[in-house]
Amino acid sequence: HTAAQDNCTCPTNKMTVCSPDGPGGRCQCRALGSGMAVDCSTLTSKCLLLKARMSAPKNARTLVRPSEHALVDNDGLYDPDCDPEGRFKARQCNQTSVCWCVNSVGVRRTDKGDLSLRCDELVRTHHILIDLRHRPTAGAFNHSDLDAELRRLFRERYRLHPKFVAAVHYEQPTIQIELRQNTSQKAAGDVDIGDAAYYFERDIKGESLFQGRGGLDLRVRGEPLQVERTLIYYLDEIPPKFSMKRLTA
């Protein structure tokens, strides 16, 4: 009888099925929807989380100017195809054979096409800009306190290496968090900025993915930081390919 058998759950992902049937009675967890093995010592990939979400009962959902190539996830939820490592496959298709190419965070980066559409490689999202507006407070937050608290959050809650939090900007009531992570910078075992941003987004919406942990209670010097709007911009290592028709719409 082991500790694993007493508490066979996945601390970092509640969208899992776990059983103490691993080697030596260890707890083994698989993602809902895909059945893929999940490493419960780190964040689960966004692709597996989206797949799990789509399989679950449908009841629960100095400032930087984003570059002209920045993508916003306007398409919402879809049931993605994930590769054996849990990453998004470069080409995604729906049940009606409409296909499109996505980046490493699963956001569409081309016009939609048919089954003949080719997506040669999974293009990496290397820069994520999280744009938040906080609820009115008595006064502005101290910028350096806010910066320190958000960096601590990404380091401790999401296990993102501090070097990938490039900057925190603040002009009341807007907060911007910049995450940067090039392919060459990401070592084995490093949390992906796309996964960290997705966990943060779900936390902010009150839909925490962590097992049994309380929701996100963000405080700066004891003062609650309550977010009323979130926008996330994704910048890829290769600019997206949309037709002019979409760009002028």
């Epitope: 082991t2 500790a3 694993a4 508490n7 996945c10 691993g22 080697p23 030596g24 260890r26 707890c27 083994q28 967890c29 093995a37 999940v38 490493d39 419960c40 010592s41 054996p84 490592e85 084995a188």
Partner: nanobody
Framework: QVQLQESGGGLVQPGGSLRLSCAAS????????MSWVRQAPGKGPEWVSY????????YYPDTVKGRFTISRDNSKNTLYLQMNNLRAEDTALYRC??????????????WGQGTMVTVSS
């Protein structure tokens, strides 16, 4: 990148034996825990053996204990699975996997394409 290539599968009669091999590359094999995982048609994957990095510790589920033996040759970057007294229910796709064992949890993070083992008379 991590590459795992299995070989040695095939058709065998009940009671027979097979030895599977897995050639590993793209990561420090001698410091990695490894497992064999199988998936029968229409079923979910299940681990059938585990070995730690230096080969000093192995685990087997009750379904294969006493029949299967996992071993490794770190000088050749190769993992093995000796399967004896095979049964029809051992029919599955067998894949080697890089594994991780903590005090409480077990997970595989990379898998090979697999080699098919069919036990039939």
């Amino acid at each position: 990148q991590v590459q795992l290539q299995e070989s040695g599968g095939g058709l065998v009669q009940p009671g027979g034996s097979l030895r599977l091999s897995c050639a590993a590359s793209g990561f420090p094999f001698s410091s990695a825990d490894m497992s064999w995982v199988r998936q029968a048609p229409g079923k979910g994957p299940e681990w059938v053996s585990y070995i730690n990095a230096d080969g000093s510790k192995t685990y087997y589920p009750d379904t294969v204990k006493g029949r299967f033996t996992i071993s490794r040759d770190n000088s050749k970057n190769t993992l093995y699975l000796q399967m004896n007294n095979l049964r029809a229910e051992d029919t599955a796709l067998y894949r080697c996997a890089r594994a991780k064992l903590t005090d409480t949890h077990y997970v595989e993070d990379y898998w090979g394409q697999g080699t098919m083992v069919t036990v039939s008379s």
